[in-house]
């Protein structure tokens, strides 16, 4: 209810004689700050005095703290929130109930905390997962309901009394909810750990033993097996007997089935721990093992390799590889099933014994045509000699020889001609089945080994062919040496590097990219007029009249090629300036007169200036000077100046005459 003080702390704390107790505690008083605090041991309420009786372990009042038990008991709290306590060292007779008597200005409260102090350090508790399986990582937990700042402890893990290699993670809790020390060990148990004893040992800071807890590991695992064979080397001859025995060294839980496997396949009706093979045949050679299962899964023994010995069987020859390419290496392998392996071989070529060849393999590093034919062999081991089996045929093959590309056309070849080539060869095994041509193009092959190039390109330089059977043999490339008119003719200005101004020295170059034949002639033309026959066209002092459209022509014995028209532009200052007057140079007063500054300039005039007969500049800057209404006083000589990016030019004087109107004359 709302009349209670609110406390939070562990319900019971555990310790042992000589250790310490740290009591984490928080509280909230009903009103105001704490004024008095008394820590009782086993407090009892006295109805007569309306007070609590019991041993006072600690006392704190407004007047100051009363030293108690030489600071063995400490109140580490404050006046409004914290009520943490420490008892160091703690004694057996501290067991029981601690009473925290709290008083504020108007309220009182007694809070009880249980303390359980044992005579000796109590053991930790090991927690195991419900099931442990071999090779599956598990976490072993060791929990001790104790932790105190003033008394460091450690938890150590032992397996059969020996410290465990795996790193443990130790954590402590000293909170109002719980007080404990915990060690967690991650561990991947093997089957051999089954039945072993794991210990969690509590030690003090110096490693001195305090207490421990032990558990026996119950590690579930598949059966672990041992296989024995008689005879022990598992080598017998056909007709002998063999016994294999399977024994379980460990299984948890108990095993439920047993079977035998040969080369990984289960043997039917063999469900005992002993396998008896009577009068064995060579087919019974192989790898044997026993498989025993329990609820975890199957376990397999090591494999026993049973070898049933017999004389070589009729042999066969394997050729690596036939057909063989002339010049390549070939290996012949004599294959004969035998146990033990054959120790000696006899080789035959076309029925004739090959001297000095006694190995399983015959290696010929460089095959020649005469090596073709039938190869056979005979194998021999300690139990006898085999029979000569059917031979193997060696076929020696080679790529087409002496391949040439032949041009069928008369020479020279000109751009646009139709060119026919043929691909010839001397000999081939196997027969030629196809031809290849380099480079590739959209060309016709009217018949096998013939190539027709319609409209041959100027850049078709060389052609090569290959005659192909299983391999392709390439001929040396032949040059078509295609002749063509000059290509990519263009006009290029050599000087000046920048724009052309009147009076500059100008050079134009007639360029082309290629020509075959190389001997060429040049022609320069402007507006249909021949100007020169050199590769360059030079102007010592260019004039505006030289501007226009220029072309150059380059020709050889095949034809001629013209450049695109190239425009020559000449920049010059305004020239030929004159002032024209409209409607004329004699105008009646009151009318309108327009003066126009006419000029020839490249680039066009960008700025005009007008001057009168006194060389006085007028405030007009456009090409036309409009006087309206014109007055007699406007009579006089005018001139203009034109300006562009190249320079300035001026006109001669032009006189404007303004005469009186009849009205003015009439008034006089």
């Amino acid at each position: 209810d709302s009349s209670k003080w609110v406390f939070e702390h562990p319900e019971t704390l555990y310790a042992w004689e000589g250790a310490c107790v740290w009591i984490p505690c928080t509280y909230r008083a009903l009103d105001g700050d704490l004024e008095s605090f008394i820590l009782f041991h086993n407090p009892e309420y006295n109805k007569n005095t309306s007070k609590f009786d019991g041993t006072r372990l600690y006392e704190s009042t407004k007047d100051g703290k009363v030293p108690s038990e030489q600071k063995r008991v400490q109140f580490l709290g404050d006046k409004n929130k914290n009520c943490t306590l420490s008892i160091h060292p703690v004694h057996l007779n501290d067991s029981g109930q601690l009473g925290l008597r709290m008083e504020s200005k108007t309220e009182k409260w007694m809070e009880r905390i249980h303390l359980n102090v044992s005579e000796r350090p109590f053991p930790p508790h090991i927690q195991l997962p419900p099931e442990i399986q071999e090779s599956q990582e598990v976490t072993l937990t060791c929990l001790l309901n104790f932790s105190c700042y003033g008394y460091p402890i450690q938890l150590q893990w032992l397996l059969e009394g020996v410290p465990m290699r795996q790193a443990a993670v130790t954590s402590t809790s000293l909170t109002i909810k719980s007080v404990f020390t915990r060690s967690e060990l991650k561990f991947s148990p093997q089957w051999s750990h089954h039945g072993k004893i794991v210990t969690c040992q509590l030690q003090d800071a110096d490693g001195k033993f305090l207490s421990n807890d032990t558990v026996q590991l119950n590690v579930k695992h598949t059966p672990k097996l041992e296989i024995k064979v008689t005879p022990s080397d598992a080598i017998v001859r056909e007709g002998d007997s063999v016994t294999m025995t399977c024994e379980v060294s460990s299984s948890n839980p108990e095993y439920t089935t047993v079977s035998w496997l040969k080369d990984g396949t289960s043997l039917k009706k063999q469900n005992t721990f002993t396998l008896n093979l009577r009068e064995v045949t060579k087919d019974q050679s192989g790898k044997y093992c026993c498989q025993v299962s329990n609820d975890v899964g199957p376990g397999r023994s090591e494999e026993v390799f049973l070898q049933v010995q017999y004389a070589p069987e009729p042999s066969t020859v394997q050729i690596l590889h036939s057909p063989a390419v002339e010049g390549s290496q070939v290996e012949f392998l004599c294959m004969s099933l035998a146990n033990p392996l054959p120790t000696n071989y006899t080789w035959y070529h076309n029925g004739k014994e090959m001297q000095g060849r006694t190995e399983e393999k015959v290696h010929i590093p460089k095959i020649l045509p005469w090596h073709a034919g039938t190869y056979s062999c005979v194998a021999e081991n300690i139990l006898g000699t085999g029979q000569r089996g059917p031979g193997a045929e060696l076929d020696v093959q080679y790529p087409p020889k002496k391949v040439t590309t032949v041009i069928q056309n008369p020479m020279p070849i000109r751009e646009g001609d139709t060119v026919t080539l043929s691909c010839n060869y001397n000999s081939s095994n196997p027969s030629v089945t196809r031809y290849e041509w380099k480079p590739h193009g959209a060309w016709e092959e009217p018949s096998l080994g013939v190539l027709k190039i319609q409209n041959v390109g100027w850049d078709n330089t060389t052609i090569a062919c290959a005659a192909c059977n299983s391999w392709c043999s390439w001929a040396s490339p032949v040059a078509l040496n295609v002749q063509y008119a000059p290509r990519d003719v263009r006009v290029r200005k050599i000087k000046p590097l920048s724009e052309i101004h009147s009076g500059n020295s100008v050079s134009l170059q007639c360029d082309f990219s290629s020509s075959h034949p190389k001997e060429v002639q040049f022609f320069w033309e402007k507006n249909g007029r021949l100007l020169g026959k050199e590769s360059q066209l030079n102007f010592d002092s260019i004039s505006p009249e030289d501007a226009g459209s220029y072309s150059c022509w380059v020709n050889n014995s095949i034809g001629q090629t013209a450049s695109k028209a190239w425009t020559l532009e000449v920049l010059y200052a305004p020239r030929r300036l004159r002032v024209s007057m409209s409607p004329g140079d004699q105008v009646m007063e009151g009318k309108s007169a327009t003066l126009t500054c006419e000029s020839d300039a490249n680039p066009p005039v960008s700025h005009y200036t007008w001057f009168d007969w006194n060389n006085q500049s007028l405030p007009y800057h456009s090409q036309k000077l409009r006087l309206e209404p014109v007055k007699v006083q406007h009579s006089g000589a005018y001139w203009c100046q034109g300006t562009n990016s190249v320079g300035k030019g001026r006109s001669p004087l032009s006189t404007l005459t303004v005469y009186y109107s009849p009205e003015t004359i009439g008034r006089r």
């Epitope: 039945g195 024995k228 024994e247 379980v248 060294s249 948890n252 047993v258 005992t272």
Partner: nanobody, 125 residues
Framework: EVQVVESGGGLVQTGGSLRLSCAAS????????VGWFRQAPGKEREFVAA????????FYSDSVKGRFTISRDNAKNTAFLQMNSLKPEDTAVYSC??????????????????WGQGTQVTVSS
């Protein structure tokens, strides 16, 4: 379920011999690892000897080594404990036990799932 029955116990003089037999049924006999244990009055159960399925592995306690011999006949589904040079301290109830967990922990009674009733062996001085 495996049933185990012992026989062959009795009274014998110090230095004498006895042969105990252990018959098992319910499973093929070569599936079973067989062990002999004894318990004297007021004492804990003690391991005596054990034999693997085929007889390839045999284990003895130090106290009986050289005097007792364990063997088995899988064709007759029986195991034997031949006890020679008997001493008064060999007096106990001898129990035969069987298991299908392998021989690696054959000396530990908690590995055995199937037990006989036991047969009394008394060695008088």
């Amino acid at each position: 379920e495996v049933q185990v029955v012992e026989s062959g116990g009795g009274l014998v003089q110090t230095g004498g011999s006895l042969r105990l037999s252990c018959a098992a049924s319910g499973r093929p006999f070569d599936w079973l690892t067989v062990g002999w244990f004894r318990q004297a009055p007021g004492k804990e159960r003690e391991f005596v000897a054990a034999i693997s399925q085929s007889g390839g592995r045999i284990f003895y306690s130090d106290s009986v080594k050289g005097r007792f011999t364990i063997s088995r006949d899988n064709a007759k589904n029986t195991a034997f404990l031949q006890m020679n040079s008997l001493k008064p301290e060999d007096t106990a109830v001898y129990s035969c036990a069987a298991q299908m967990r392998g021989y690696s922990r054959a000396a530990y009674p908690d590995e055995y799932d199937y037990w006989g009733q036991g047969t009394q062996v008394t060695v008088s001085s």
